[in-house]
Interface confidence: low
């Protein structure tokens, strides 16, 4: 089962933009100039029933 | 049917750069990444960077400071630009990219372009 | 990095042998394992990813097995087709990174 997309950080992006994404997808996260990022910078939709993320979103800070 | 096709220069002089083009058909670049690959006899095979559907990138921390990795959508083409090439960046390069927008494994490839460094 | 060790360079086969290749991990990699066959003058050709699924195409003689920092590629009933060089590539972290390949050898 796939992953249910997570929210870009404030001040910050996330890639790829999708909403779904297949088990065994990386999600990769990247702060604007200034800010630092905090958390892991690639997660995984780790397969199951239903599949995970492998780690909680990433936040931005200045 | 999803093809990678390169073009770039064979001979590079050191200290110079390197670019190569990655064009791409059976799929949109708006929803798929593209990697770059390379090999040679003495590193083997080494993960270069990719630059997402999205458009963001990644890079190899080793190479970072050297690489750029662009696209042009609506050609359908990557390219991939190195900076200050020394004799020990002699080696094959590889465009790829998997079966959706998030793997880091490698489904389709290019048919690779021989690098050689050397004055 | 993770580091990945392909413990043989070269192993020497029999046609219509089976062939065990190993891979072992630096950490642990939770089966985000791809294998790759290169032949003299092409691209790698993936034949497995998730560790264990084999992709469209490849004949049912390959198999993927493992888990943790261990996986292994077997070939049963060898053909002269798959007298290649294999490798092993994690992508549980990034950068991906590969094995130094085990090339096959006719004996």
């Known amino acids: 089962k796939p992953c249910h997309g997570l929210s870009a950080p404030e001040n910050g992006a996330r890639s790829p933009e999708k909403q779904l994404h297949p088990a065994g997808a990386t999600i990769h996260f990247s702060c604007a100039p200034g800010y630092v990022l905090k958390g892991q910078a690639s997660i995984k939709c780790v397969p199951g029933h239903p599949s995970h993320w492998s780690d909680p979103p990433p936040i931005c800070r200045a | 049917q999803v093809q990678l096709k390169q073009s770039g220069p064979g001979l590079v002089a050191p200290s110079q750069s390197l670019s190569i083009t990655c064009t791409v058909s059976g799929f949109s670049l708006t929803s798929y990444g593209v990697d770059w690959v390379r090999q040679s006899p003495g590193k083997g095979l080494e993960w270069l960077g990719v630059?997402?559907?999205?458009?963001?990138?990644n890079y190899n921390s080793a190479l970072k400071s050297r690489l750029s990795i662009t696209k042009d959508n609506s050609k359908s083409q990557v390219f991939l630009k190195m900076n200050s090439l020394q004799t020990d960046d002699t080696a094959m390069y590889y465009c790829?990219?998997?079966?959706?927008?998030?793997?880091?494994?490698?489904?389709?490839w290019g048919q690779g372009t021989l690098v050689t460094v050397s004055a | 990095d993770i580091q990945m060790t392909q413990s043989s360079s070269y192993l020497s086969v029999s046609l219509g042998g089976r062939v065990t290749i190993t891979c072992k991990a630096s950490d642990h990699i939770n089966n985000w394992l791809a294998w790759y066959q290169q032949k003299p003058g092409n691209a790698p050709r993936l034949l497995i990813s998730?560790?264990?699924s084999l992709e469209t195409g490849v004949p049912s003689r390959f198999s993927g097995s493992g888990s943790g920092k261990d996986y292994t590629l077997s070939i049963t009933s060898l053909q002269t087709e798959d007298v290649a060089t294999y490798y092993c590539?994690?992508?549980?972290?990034?950068?991906?990174?590969f094995g130094a390949g085990t090339k096959l050898e006719l004996k």
């Open positions: 590539q994690q992508y549980w972290s990034t950068p991906p990174t």
């Open positions: 790829a990219s998997g079966d959706y927008d998030g793997s880091l494994w490698f489904a389709y």
């Open positions: 630059i997402w559907g999205g458009g963001s990138t």
């Open positions: 998730g560790a264990t």
